[in-house]
């Protein structure tokens, strides 16, 4: 299709080389009431369309994204050619930063309902560059945490080193929806609730003598509870003796609950005590079996290919630890009688 009639928007993504970062493009197709630009190449001001203007934006999950190759080749369907770019409804998610994301991205409705809709498309010229200025060493992160129940703020990473006074007007989006009341480089949250979690986008306009473009940054906001004050809790095994059959294989599971910590380094391991000796056992990797806002349950198993007489004299100890402290649970094997 002919993209010459598409409205054009220029965007800049300046990414930090020291952090993981995502980026998004919205398919900014005009809303019905301001969709005249879809038809401006087709109608003179005196002409009035007999049908309503383009309505595709009512269901923006129905859009198609393309990339325009720089060598003039035909448009490429994003879904087929770019595994690191994901389409979610009307939004294009870039999962990894890099200058190779620079280029022209075009979106248009999948369903063309009338000849007027053919020109209803948006071309986004995206320039991607690494952050070079070291002047702003402490720019806001692209991953920000809000503590539930307290006050907090979300800062626009590309503007966090500027004072509120010198900051340009910012347009904020949350999960793709415009936050019309927010215009500063920082959103202040009086009391944090779990619904404040999400993907925030901040845009501001930068201009030079030739042109203007939108500078965009994406912030993943997580609502969290305060760090736990408790050591981990062993949930299994609860018995300190276990009846076993000699010569049979045995798996003993250790499950422990770890409270939330922002910097989370849980330790869960098995070791064996045999008279005065003790040694750590190399066992399968630990795995998370349940995760909530407040805590996580992690499991690690010890596997004996077959239980021997020697194992009955040993103690199998599960050791769990977080930044607060540690807990242990020992298990003594006992031969099953009869």
């Amino acid at each position: 299709f002919n993209i010459s009639g598409c409205s054009t928007k220029k965007l800049l993504w300046t990414y930090s080389t020291r952090s993981e970062e995502e980026f998004v493009l919205f398919c900014d197709l005009p809303e019905p009431q301001k969709s005249h630009f879809c038809h401006r190449n087709r109608l003179s001001p005196k002409q009035v369309p007999e049908h309503l203007p383009f309505m595709g934006s009512n269901d923006l999950s129905d859009v198609q994204w393309y990339q325009q190759p720089s060598n003039g080749d035909p448009l490429e369907d994003i879904r087929k050619s770019y595994p690191h770019i994901i389409q979610d409804k009307c939004t294009l998610h870039f999962l990894t930063p890099g200058v190779n994301n620079s280029g022209s991205y075009i979106c248009r409705p999948k369903m063309i309902k009338s000849p007027y809709d053919v020109a209803c498309c948006v071309k986004m010229i995206l320039e991607v560059k690494p952050q070079t200025n070291a002047s702003c060493e402490y720019s806001a992160s692209h991953k920000q945490d809000l503590l539930l129940g307290s006050t907090g703020s979300i800062s626009c990473p590309s503007l966090s080193c500027q004072s509120d006074a010198q900051s340009p007007a910012v347009t904020w989006y949350k999960n793709g929806k415009l936050l019309s009341v927010e215009r500063s480089n920082r959103i202040v949250v009086d009391e944090v609730y779990d619904y404040h979690q999400g993907t925030y986008v901040c845009d501001y306009t930068q201009s030079d003598t030739v042109s203007s473009w939108t500078v965009r940054a994406v912030v993943q906001v997580r609502t969290i509870v305060g760090d736990t004050k408790l050591k981990p809790d062993i949930l299994d095994p609860v018995e300190d003796t276990l009846e076993v059959e000699l010569g049979k294989p045995l798996t003993i599971s250790c499950k422990a609950r770890f409270g939330f910590e922002r910097v989370f380094n849980p330790v869960i391991k098995w070791y064996i005590k045999d008279s005065d000796l003790e040694w750590e056992v190399s066992v399968p990797e630990a795995k998370s079996i349940k995760s909530t806002l407040k805590d996580e349950i992690i499991e690690r198993n010890i596997i004996l290919e077959k239980v021997t007489q020697r194992d009955l004299r040993r103690k199998f100890v599960c050791f769990v630890q977080n930044s607060i402290g540690n807990t242990t649970q020992s298990v003594q094997l006992k031969e099953k009688r009869g």
Epitope: K229, L235, P237, R257, G325, T327, Q329, S330
Partner: antibody, heavy 117, light 110 residues
């Protein structure tokens, strides 16, 4: 809060199930214990059920009691009561950490079980 | 298993007085000790945890102390409402093991 029910007079050998109903907190976050007290005697720990449904019983209680739970209740089944099991049975939230020490709080008012022929 | 021994079995004191209850563990339990109060016809109530920390809403007339194997509960400015049986409990718990309570001490207020 925690409240026990189901205590009554039963004949020896007749199974009996006591129920502990909780409100104001979730059993998916806390272990629950049963403790009993014979008339004029001290507290005797029976066992607990934790958030992943692992159960623990003190040695003397093994085989004599079974603890199970639903989303808001914790049951204690006395499999074959004897006259020695006559006591007030308490349900308590815990063991759970307070200052990294395991305590029991709150306790229910208790329910009296009398085993007699 | 840890065995908790409480002394005396019964103690009597006048209103305004002070009573001291002792609890001995058969092995060192750090400061892993709680005290409970049980009034006649009622259920136990947590008073003190970690040997010396007052539970929420408990009067500062109750004081816990001790470490290792020897622990003490002191009730000062005795009131009639303090007439109850007091139990100590080893709160160290590594996932299993019995939860040993002491035998209890009856406090009679005259």
């Amino acid at each position: 809060s925690v409240e026990e029910s189901g205590g009554r007079l039963v004949a020896p050998g007749t199974p009996l199930t006591l129920t502990c109903t909780v409100s104001g907190f979730s059993l998916s976050n806390y272990a629950m214990s049963w403790v009993r007290q014979a008339p004029g005697k001290g507290l005797e720990y029976i066992g607990f059920i934790n958030i992943i449904d692992s159960t623990y019983y003190t040695n003397w209680a093994k085989g004599r009691f079974t603890i199970s739970k639903t989303s808001t209740t914790v049951d204690l089944k006395m499999t074959s009561p004897t006259t020695e099991d006559t006591a007030t049975y308490f349900c308590a939230r815990g063991p759970y950490y307070v200052n990294n020490e395991n305590v029991f709080d709150p306790w229910g008012p208790g329910t009296l079980v009398t085993v007699s022929s | 298993d840890v065995v908790m021994t409480q002394t005396p079995a019964s103690v009597s004191a006048a209103v305004g007085g002070t009573v001291t209850i002792k609890c001995q563990a058969s092995q060192s339990i750090g400061s892993s000790l709680a005290w409970y109060q049980q009034k006649p016809g009622q259920s136990p109530k947590l008073l003190i945890y970690s040997a010396s920390n007052l539970a929420s809403g408990v009067s500062s007339r109750f004081k816990g102390s001790g470490s290792g194997t020897e622990y003490t509960l002191t009730i000062s400015d005795l009131e009639c409402a303090d007439a109850a049986t007091y139990y100590c409990q080893c709160t160290y718990y590594g996932g299993s093991g019995d939860v040993p309570f002491g035998g209890g001490t009856e406090v009679v207020v005259k």
